[in-house]
Each structure stands twice: as C-alpha cells, then as structure tokens.
Interface confidence: medium
Amino acid sequence: HPIPDSSPLLQFGGQVRQRYLYTDDAQQTEAHLEIREDGTVGGAADQSPESLLQLKALKPGVIQILGVKTSRFLCQRPDGALYGSLHFDPEACSFRELLLEDGYNVYQSEAHGLPLHLPGNKSPHRDPAPRGPARFLPLPGLPPALPEPPGILAPQPPDVGSSDPLSMVGPSQGRSPSYAS
C-alpha cells in the first residue's frame, strides 16, 4: 500500500508523490487541478495528463507542485492568481500543506498565506480571495518516467504592474514572477 498522504513521513524533504488534486467544494464544480502547457491553471472534470501532479516536500509541511506532463511548477501571485512556471521561485511556488482529518488537504501559499483555489468565475485582479480555503483530495497517480527538470529561464505571466505587461517592447527577459499588486 502507498504511504497515506496523512503520514508524517511525507512532511519531510525529498518525499515525492504523484497525485491528482481533486476538489468537490460546493462553490465550484467537481474538478481536478491541471497545469496547462502554456502556463494557465484550471480545472478538468476528468483526470488528464495535465492534471497529474508531482508533489515534493521541500521541508516539513511545505511542498512544491509540478505538472508532470508540462514540467511547470504551480505558482501563485500575491493577488491569489495561479499560474504554471517553468522556473521554480521558492517565494511564489511553495505551498504549505495542511492535512484534514477526512483525507482532504488544504494548500496555502507559504509566502502570502493565500489559500489555493482553482480559478473561480471572478477575475483575481478584482476579487483576490473571496472564499475560504478549497479542500483538495489527493488521488494517487501512477508514476510515469519523470521529465527532465525545467530550465531556469522561462516566460512569466503578464506583468500587470508593468508598462509592457506582455513583453511587447522586447523579448522576455525572464522576469521574476512576483507581481506588483
């Protein structure tokens, strides 16, 4: 049997799990969190290659979440919006994993303390954290061969605080994913 996600062994660095993060919160339809190849994050009704995630413990109670197919890390902006990045930024892409008694987990940005939600119906630019924490059920996924680790330089989400939010003046310089609020 696999070690259950509630095991304290999984709270220490180096432990790796492959999971689908499933949510059935009343506020949204049932969905699996997926990190798409272009860096958008959404929910899929069914398990998909983009929703198979690698959860790796960085330190006790803190994990990184990597999309196995897309080699993108799940990251969160200070306003709560989620995106998938080719570059792991410890501040934007580290999540505290809180284990609930019923087998569900809650995830919070370690840096900002914001709860992890699937993108809702409102733009996060106007409605940063309208709900309580979303509960995710980690469902086991068979571990395929892992992709090569992502490179250091990567496109970043549009910088809303920038005068050139989509890097239209020049090529991407691999900006930090931190956002001007």
Epitope: R36, E37, D38, G39, T40, G42, K69, T70, S71, A81, Y83, L86, P119, G120, N121, S123, H125, R126, P147, L153, A154, P155, P157, P158, V160, L166, S167, M168, G170, P171, S172
Partner: antibody
Framework: QVQLQQSGAELARPGASVKLSCKAS????????ISWVKQRTGQGLEWIGE????????YYNEKFKGKATLTADKSSSTAYMELRSLTSEDSAVYFC??????????WGQGTTLTVSS | MSASPGERVTMTCSAG?????MYWYQQKPRSSPKPWIY???NLASGVPARFSGSGSGTSYSLTISSMEAEDAATYYC?????????FGGGTKVEIK
C-alpha cells in the same frame, strides 16, 4: 522584437496537401506555444490547434484532427502546419500566433490558401 | 454595431459555460488580429485607456468609453477554460 514570419500564399488542387510555415524570432522559441488559427473570407476566427516546441506536445481542435498536423523544428525556430485532403472549405487565411498564459500575444501576417481546380 | 464619435460602446460575449477569464482581440480588414485585453480586464500594451474589459462566469464585456474613428474594427473574444480554445463570432464596430 518578437516576430512571426509566415510563408507566402499557396494555390493547391483539391485532394492535395500543403505545408505552411511560421518562423519565430525575437524570443526563446521553446518557452511558448504556437497556435494556428483559420479565418475564411468575411468570417470569424477558428482555433485549429497548438504545438509546444519544448516538448513537441500537440493539442487539436477535434474538428481539425485528421485535417491538420502540427510540427516544429527547434533548430530553425519554425513551426509548420500540414493540411491534407484539401477541399474548397480549406480556402482561408491561416495565422500562426504565439501563446502565452492563455493569450495569443503575437500574430503572424497570415498565409492565404486557395484550393481550386 | 455603429457608434458616433464620443459615444460609449459596449459589446458582450457570452460563454456556453462558466469560464475563468476572457481575452479580446481587435482586427481590422486585411490585417492580423491584435491582442487587446487579457485576463478579462487588463489592457495589452499600446491599447488606449478608453478601452476596458469586465465580466465573470458566462458573461463578459468590452467597453469603449468614448468612441474614436480608429476604434472601428471587429472585436473577438476568446476563452480557454476548456478545450478547444474558442473565439466568439466577432462584433463589428463602425463609426457613424
């Protein structure tokens, strides 16, 4: 600056195949997706599919599966779309566009395909 | 739709099911589409401040606060909360 340079206009016979190209410059080709979009004269935009050169993963609109095949050559930073079994319905302008976080942020100038006997 | 200079113009885009964000593009005849609004409400580089975007769920809109001649174009909305990415049919805005 970012540019997507598409191949020139094509005239093809019904039943034939054609391969359109889109050469990218001004950015790291493997860090973004390339989508292809169809626009018939006087009509709207229709997403055909997308390729991610870093992984060669492709995603298609179900409607264009079997019609379009997307490939990419990392060494030349060029994306290709092959259209097969051409009919008059395939006559259109085809755009390639760069995909960034769900948004098509740069577009090629378009390639006009005319299918006629 | 047709609008006089200085008039406020609002065009809407209705999704078949709830989507997280909407994106908008402007296209003029014989030209490629241009990125216009991303993540529902953010203006792409170079887009005049008279444009704005809003909406949530299945209902989104693009507004021109004060119509100018150069705004005459067709505007397309686009989503990718689900596959395939889909564009709206486009709204043609003309100047009176």
């Amino acid at each position: 600056q970012v540019q997507l340079q598409q191949s020139g206009a094509e005239l093809a016979r019904p039943g034939a195949s054609v391969k359109l190209s889109c050469k990218a410059s001004g950015y790291t080709f493997t860090n973004y997706g390339i989508s292809w979009v169809k626009q018939r004269t006087g009509q709207g935009l229709e997403w055909i599919g997308e390729i991610y050169p870093r992984s060669d993963n492709t995603y298609y609109n179900e409607k264009f599966k079997g019609k379009a095949t997307l490939t990419a050559d990392k060494s030349s930073s060029t994306a290709y779309m092959e259209l097969r079994s051409l009919t008059s319905e395939d006559s259109a302008v085809y755009f390639c566009t760069r995909s960034d976080y769900g948004f098509f942020d740069y577009w090629g100038q378009g390639t006009t395909l005319t299918v006629s006997s | 739709m047709s609008a006089s200079p200085g008039e406020r113009v609002t065009m809407t885009c209705s999704a078949g099911s709830s989507v997280s964000y909407m994106y908008w593009y402007q296209q003029k005849p014989r030209s490629s589409p241009k990125p216009w609004i991303y993540l529902t409400s953010n203006l792409a580089s170079g887009v005049p401040a008279r444009f704005s975007g809003s909406g949530s769920g299945t209902s989104y809109s693009l507004t021109i606060s004060s119509m100018e001649a150069e705004d005459a174009a067709t505007y397309y909305c686009q989503q990718w909360s689900s596959n395939p990415r889909t564009f709206g049919g486009g709204t043609k805005v003309e100047i009176k």
